[in-house]
Amino acid sequence: KDSAPTVVSGILGGSVTLPLNISVDTEIENVIWIGPKNALAFARPKENVTIMVKSYLGRLDITKWSYSLCISNLTLNDAGSYKAQINQRNFEVTTEEEFTLFVYEQLQEPQVTMKSVKVSENFSCNITLMCSVKGAEKSVLYSWTPREPHASESNGGSILTVSRTPCDPDLPYICTAQNPVSQRSSLPVHVGQFCTDPGASRGTAAGKTVVGILGEPVTLPLEFRATRATKNVVWVFNTSVISQERRGAATADSRRKPKGSEERRVRTSDQDQSLKISQLKMEDAGPYHAYVCSEASRDPSVRHFTLLVYKRLEKPSVTKSPVHMMNGICEVVLTCSVDGGGNNVTYTWMPLQNKAVMSQGKSHLNVSWESGEHLPNFTCTAHNPVSNSSSQFSSGTICSGPERNKR
């Protein structure tokens, strides 16, 4: 017959039927099924089917009445052209039905990988995602959700390039792979974190430095009035979105911030969208960026901050070295230190005179004087950017008698 072959798709390991529309009252002499390479089976009414090809034994059947061919446990080698030759009783003409069988594998879960990120001067970036299915052949079609009009698909849909700014909501992208017998969707992929690095295109931008005290609140001041044109403010710490304030209540990004009390610790001011952090932790220190997003333009304006977190200094402790006496001159080293003060602590001593000399980052005071000479009390003050704390060392008679002549 002249019509195109009927296309039938089957799944690897599954079953398929090549259907013949032979009515029940048609008197059949015999039906011969011919496979991709040679004759497969011969069927006559009221007789057992004769299977002629070894590889089809136990996998091939011909249905009664309709003489359709059923193949089970499909292999990739079963794909190809099939032909049924139908001989009717009292008919001299043999009618033929042709089929093309395709055998496809069940798709595995598609994997989405990020191929590239290009960050531009205006903080927008082009992110290229690639979707692939392990072991899949060319017959796989790919599609993406959401199917944005401004996104571009290439390589048969397997590559998606999206343009976004930190102002855009961090939507999940899903790749769906499809072949004629199966469909699989990928895990959702969030691309927002790839587009929140303001240093990626121009080196780290300088901004305002804010100093905070461990355990106390701090505000990163945005100092602007939200207008009708302001859509939202996105606050980014390092490269993670921590707050996406949308005209009203702040909504913490639930993928990156813990729920509960931690979520309430960081919030934005309803008045000017400044970032307020209560109960500062040392790990809160670092670069912050506020992207002020406008309804009118996709390009945000950006404010940069560096948050430094210091501990309030405890009272310093003063220790003295063993006294060293030689030729009637006493020498002692006083050391001032603060527990857990960190590396940003400086020290000063009072009073300073020619007999007392500071050394080693000012934490040590070298004192020398004549035996019996009156010594003042010395005060050590520890300083860091958020606090000062002092301790007095009472000199007393630390070098008054001959029993102290040796170390």
Epitope: E109, P146, R147, P149, P169, S182, Q183, S185, L187
Partner: antibody, heavy 116, light 106 residues
Framework: QMQLQESGPELVKPGASVKISCKAS????????INWVQQRPGQGLEWIGW????????YYSEKFKAKATLTVDKSSSTAYMLLSSLTSEDSAVYFC?????????WGQGTTLTVSS | QIVLTQSPAIMSASPGEKVTVTCSAS?????MFWYQQKPGFSPRLLIY???NLASGVPVRFSGSGSGTSYSLTISRMEAEDAATYYC?????????FGGGTKLEIK
């Protein structure tokens, strides 16, 4: 035969919570996203959110973030939607639907009535 | 979110008549999807990717359009086509539906 079978109608009091189920059959449950859609009486359709049974990942419409919680039980190929703090505004038919991009198969719908 | 506006909201057609339902998007979308819903039933997918017929849908249904303007056409109205028709987009989150067009038989 591909099918999404939803649980029966519910009549609950304001302030209560309700859990609707959607049992999938005839396909591999973990391979497809399950969406939930609300249809209020005489109204159109509104998307609530999706869950990916493979991983349990969820995504919600801003409007339903505080209202709906989506979960799945892979062993029984069943998706669930918990609706909390119910008011009369939540009275609607809730559909589960399969797919990404569009919804190729739908459940028959669960009618929820919130009334004191 | 993208708002989809369908028109007309209600219409009636005689058997054999050509019917066109339009769907206008508040901003550009890549593809449109169409569903049919009969009273007491769940929606049924008719058209996917703007113009592709879903499995088992009669060929008298067709879809077309691009950008912000899309349409669903029934070439020859039949009694069983009386239903409400919804358009849907998923070019951005959240996916949204049109308000529906109720099609009655004359």
């Amino acid at each position: 035969q591909m099918q999404l079978q939803e649980s029966g109608p519910e009549l609950v009091k304001p302030g209560a919570s309700v859990k609707i189920s959607c049992k999938a059959s005839g396909y591999t449950f973990t391979h497809y996203y399950i969406n939930w859609v609300q249809q209020r009486p005489g109204q159109g359709l509104e998307w609530i959110g999706w869950i990916f049974p493979e991983s349990g990942s969820t995504y919600y419409s801003e409007k339903f973030k505080a209202k709906a919680t989506l979960t799945v039980d892979k062993s029984s190929s069943t998706a669930y939607m918990l609706l909390s703090s119910l008011t009369s505004e939540d009275s609607a038919v809730y559909f589960c639907a399969r797919g990404t991009g569009f919804f190729d198969y739908w459940g028959q719908g669960t009618t929820l009535t919130v009334s004191s | 979110q993208i708002v989809l506006t369908q028109s007309p909201a209600i219409m009636s057609a005689s058997p054999g008549e050509k019917v066109t339902v339009t769907c206008s998007a508040s901003s550009s979308v890549s593809y449109m999807f169409w569903y049919q819903q009969k009273p007491g039933f769940s929606p049924r997918l008719l058209i996917y990717d703007t113009s592709n017929l879903a499995s088992g849908v009669p060929v008298r249904f067709s879809g077309s359009g691009s950008g912000t303007s899309y349409s669903l056409t029934i070439s020859r109205m039949e009694a069983e086509d009386a239903a409400t028709y919804y358009c849907q987009q998923w070019s951005s989150y959240p996916p949204t539906f049109g308000g529906g067009t109720k099609l009655e038989i004359k």
